[in-house]
């Protein structure tokens, strides 16, 4: 009678063999910044160290009575979810607790910052193995909170946080909005986003993935062997902190970028009922539910990629949106999306020595998103090859001409306000995989990369009749690095990658009066690294 | 997950030191910004995190904090330095009147100041 949440994050291979996941996480220290905790609860006794750190505001109300079991309830439950003997995810992980929330579950940004600094200082004084910091709390967007999280992440610490329980865009909250933090939304046993009273889990592009967060069994501070069921994005974040501890115990040298990519890779895909989210947030919200890897094997041989959406550009004519990859990731392609279809494309630019993806709004447009495809590829070296608008009927073309460089993505950008008034190009002739083709009025940008053993292929799926959505997926063993539409006509809203599938969206053609000549194709670039495959075979 | 999300109030004050002479003035044309939580009930006015520029030397945090206290005292304001940050961000946490924000934003090395706000268990 395993609790539903532990079953959900356990891969089918474990369940089929009636295999208990290893008591993993033993090489990892998890810091919990929360309420006080009942450290002698049997679930966590002996595996929790209560630090002397405490930075909490006074409780509200003159008649507030501090009751130990109430003061400890939130933190005790989460400690149990992370590493509880019976109902924990990472049963071997050690825990250190810092009290930053008072008996009413309230704290301050400043108190939490001092807590994060305490962790950094501890790390400098006595460096240990991998560290995971669990922040099961949320406040309004805070520049300083996000900056502190960024610094701690860059010092090699994995930060995991709750997306928030406000049924709102997680980007409006901190630390959920910090790019370096792994932000976790909550789902229930039916894979529905969790409803909490009139509110529920936060969503949007600042959420990295979801995890079980409703009716989660965990240690109760009511007694030393009591359990209680609680719900919230804190519980979801605790699951991911536990999974992270397991992964880091198996591969202690994993970087934050590698860990995040693995969390995404091993998640259950497309199981969440997206109808729960506001319509404009569905495309931005990852449809991923966290799970443990099928075994503690090293997954280093895979080419991992993820999709990063920018903030919305806003509607002004010259507005742009920028999507960035994490520090150790490489931007392999760049695309854009606009709900109105009014956009002027996208391109890869250098910014502070790193490649970024910039999308451009068009006159009369409601704004655009830039979409970066961010990948982990050792010893990669990329450059962008650009062709100016050709003006010729065949359209603009550009290819990767450097020796050993392969095409990982195509972007197009145009200055004209509406490509729809210009004749679209014919489809790219086949047999030229290292080539990007676009509208004759657009400049075309090819992302060309070199890495040991990197090979890529172009996969196209065209539909002769107008369609709201065209998709093309990469086969097993191949990873989607690039996704773009062909041709770049006005009714194309944009292209983006969802897991290993390239999605090209068009306007509802029945309302635009478009003719069937305006067919659309999705072009996927699928890559793999023979070098990584060989390395993994040598490991085994 | 970006640092440039909307719904976040930002008050930019152009800096020009008048009373305190050039020693207190920042580099020409520099601006420090003030931030506070967009969700009003969560604001905690009276406590501020003063964040210094990234390249600021460790010792500068204490020095800037003392400087703020001295200048505030000259104006008849009491301030209390609650914490000095060294290991994550250069800066300090100060309890002071909001009247002193303009003064604090004019201090050398200041990148931005953020009003404290509440966080909640989720």
């Amino acid at each position: 009678s395993i609790p539903w949440n532990l079953e959900r994050i356990t891969p089918a291979r474990y369940r089929a063999d009636e295999y208990q996941p290893p008591k993993g996480g033993s090489l990892v220290e998890v810091y919990l910044l929360d309420t006080s905790i009942q450290s002698d609860h049997r679930e966590i006794e002996g595996r929790v160290m209560v630090t002397d750190f405490e930075s909490v505001p006074e409780e509200d109300g003159t008649r507030f009575h501090r009751q130990a079991s109430k003061c400890d309830s939130h933190g005790t439950h989460l400690a149990g979810v992370v590493s509880g003997r019976d109902a924990g995810v990472a049963k071997g992980a050690g825990l250190r607790s810092l009290r930053v929330l008072n008996c009413q579950g309230k704290g301050t940004v400043s108190g939490t910052l001092i807590g994060l600094e305490f962790i950094r200082k501890s790390q400098l004084v006595q460096p240990v193995g991998p560290l995971v910091v669990l922040l099961p709390l949320a406040g309004g967007y805070s520049r300083v909170f996000n900056a502190a999280c960024q610094r701690l992440a860059r010092a090699g610490v994995v930060l995991v946080t709750a997306a928030g329980n406000f049924r709102d865009d997680a980007c409006l909250y901190s630390p959920a909005s910090a790019p370096e933090v792994i932000t976790v939304g909550a789902t229930n046993a039916q894979d529905q986003p969790v409803t909490l009273g009139t509110l529920g889990t936060n969503f949007g592009r600042c959420v990295d993935l979801f995890a079980p967060g409703e009716d989660i069994i965990g240690a109760s501070s009511d007694c030393s062997t009591c359990f209680v069921s609680r719900s919230g994005t804190s519980q979801a974040a605790a699951h991911v902190a536990g999974i992270a501890a397991m992964m880091l115990s198996a591969e202690p040298e994993l970087t934050l970028a590698e860990l995040r990519q693995r969390l995404i890779h091993f998640s259950a895909k497309d199981v969440i009922n997206e109808a729960w989210f506001p319509e404009d947030q569905r495309v931005l919200t990852p449809n991923l539910v966290a799970a443990l890897p099928p075994s503690t094997h090293r997954a280093g041989w895979q080419l991992f990629c993820r999709t990063v959406w920018s903030a919305h550009s806003g509607p002004t004519r010259m507005a742009t949106a920028v999507a960035r990859c994490a520090q150790d990731e490489e931007l392999l392609s760049c695309s854009s999306f606009s709900r109105s279809g009014k956009r002027r494309g996208e391109r890869i630019e250098a910014q502070g020595g790193k490649r970024v993806c910039r999308a451009h709004n068009a006159f009369g447009g409601e704004g655009v998103y830039a979409i970066a495809r961010c990948c982990l590829l050792p010893q990669v070296n990329c450059s962008v090859h650009t062709a100016p608008p050709a003006g010729a009927s065949m359209g603009t073309r550009v290819h990767c001409h450097q020796q050993g460089h392969v095409l990982t993505g195509c972007s197009s950008h145009w200055e004209v306000e509406d490509l729809g008034t210009h004749k679209p190009p014919v489809l790219r002739p086949r047999g030229q995989p290292n080539q990007c083709v676009g509208h004759r009025e657009a400049s075309i940008h090819a992302s060309c990369c070199h890495a040991p053993g990197l090979e890529c292929k172009v996969k196209e799926h065209g539909i002769p009749a107008p369609q709201e959505q065209v998709i093309v997926a990469c086969e097993d063993g191949w990873t989607l690095t690039g996704c773009s539409p062909l041709p770049g006509t006005s009714h194309v809203l944009g292209a983006y990658a969802v897991d290993n599938t390239c999605v090209v969206r068009s306007r509802d053609v029945s309302t635009t009066g478009s003719t069937s000549k305006e067919a659309v194709a999705a072009v996927a670039i699928c890559c793999r690294s023979r070098h990584l495959v060989q390395a993994s075979q040598e490991l085994q | 997950q970006e640092d440039e999300d909307g719904d976040y109030e930002e008050l930019v004050l152009a800096l020009r030191s008048e009373e305190d002479g050039l020693a207190d003035a920042p580099e020409h044309g520099a601006t420090a910004t003030f931030h506070r939580c967009a969700k009003d009930p969560w604001r905690l006015p009276g406590t501020y995190v003063v964040v210094l520029k990234e390249e600021t030397h460790r010792s500068q945090s204490e020095r800037t904090a003392r400087r703020l206290q001295a200048q505030a005292a000259r104006r008849g304001y009491l301030t209390k330095i609650l914490h000095v940050f060294h290991h994550l961000l250069p800066g300090f946490l100060v309890k002071m009147s909001g009247d002193l924000l303009e003064l604090a934003l004019k201090l050398p090395h200041v990148d931005y100041i953020e009003e404290d706000s509440s966080v909640f268990a989720q």
């Epitope: 609790p3 049997r42 679930e43 509880g84 003997r85 019976d86 007694c223 062997t225 009591c226 209680v228 | -």
Partner: antibody
Framework: EVQLLESGGGLVQPGGSLRLSCKAS????????INWVRQAPGKGLEWIGR????????RYNEKFKGKATISRDNSKNTLYLQMNSLRAEDTAVYYC???????????WGQGTLVTVSS | EIVLTQSPATLSLSPGERATITCRAS??????LNWYQQKPGQAPRLLIY???NRATGIPARFSGSGSGTDFTLTISSLEPEDFAVYYC??????????FGGGTKVEIK
């Protein structure tokens, strides 16, 4: 050797009260919680409450709040159960039991029979 | 409030046979469940703690298993002195201590 010895049972009039004692020996008295459990004739076990001799903290089954009071005298290594407003249904064998680290009852007294009858 | 349901209420077996008693909790209790033996006219005696650990001095023929909500007490080969009433017990918040209704193991 750990020992718990109850005393104070007997015949009580309905509406009356009585005080049971539990004398502990053979271990550090203040380290272990002591619980009172009763068993009506031919019935199962029913928990009344507990005391932490270290700090005197008590906890009761809601059913017995206001009816039972648990106390201790550390100088005598003795626990007490005061029962008020006794009725016929309070007739039972009353046991004191030591809670090992608060989770299982590793040592029990021999029990003392309380009969409530007119 | 957690309810512990023991089954069967009575078990009629002969010496040397295997006895299996189950205890089902109405809520998740992890592995924090204890088993006691009570003979007529005596106080209960702790047999198994934390679902599967034998208490001091308990013979190896007694074993416990299970976690979560379903637990089993097994006596591999009944001895004459094993005929008694067996209770399961957990800690909860209100009331803090809960006992099962008991299972009587009698001689067939």
């Amino acid at each position: 050797e750990v020992q718990l010895l109850e005393s104070g049972g007997g015949l009580v009039q309905p509406g009356g009260s009585l005080r049971l004692s539990c004398k502990a020996s053979g271990y550090t008295f203040s380290r272990y919680g002591i619980n009172w459990v009763r068993q009506a004739p031919g019935k199962g076990l029913e928990w009344i409450g507990r005391i932490d001799p270290g700090n005197g903290g008590t906890r009761y089954n809601e059913k017995f709040k206001g009816k039972a009071t648990i106390s201790r005298d550390n100088s005598k290594n003795t626990l007490y159960l005061q029962m008020n407003s006794l009725r016929a249904e309070d007739t039972a064998v009353y046991y004191c039991a030591r809670a090992n680290d608060g989770y299982s009852f590793d040592y029990w007294g021999q029990g003392t029979l309380v009969t409530v009858s007119s | 409030e957690i309810v512990l349901t023991q089954s069967p209420a009575t078990l009629s077996l002969s010496p040397g046979e295997r006895a299996t008693i189950t205890c089902r909790a109405s809520q998740y209790v992890g592995s924090y469940l204890n088993w006691y033996q009570q003979k007529p006219g005596q106080a209960p005696r702790l047999l198994i703690y934390d679902a599967s650990n034998r208490a001091t001095g308990i013979p190896a023929r007694f074993s416990g298993s299970g976690s979560g909500t379903d637990f089993t007490l097994t006596i591999s080969s009944l001895e004459p002195e094993d005929f008694a009433v067996y209770y399961c017990q957990v800690w909860d918040s209100s009331p803090p201590v809960v006992f099962g209704g008991g299972t009587k193991v009698e001689i067939k």
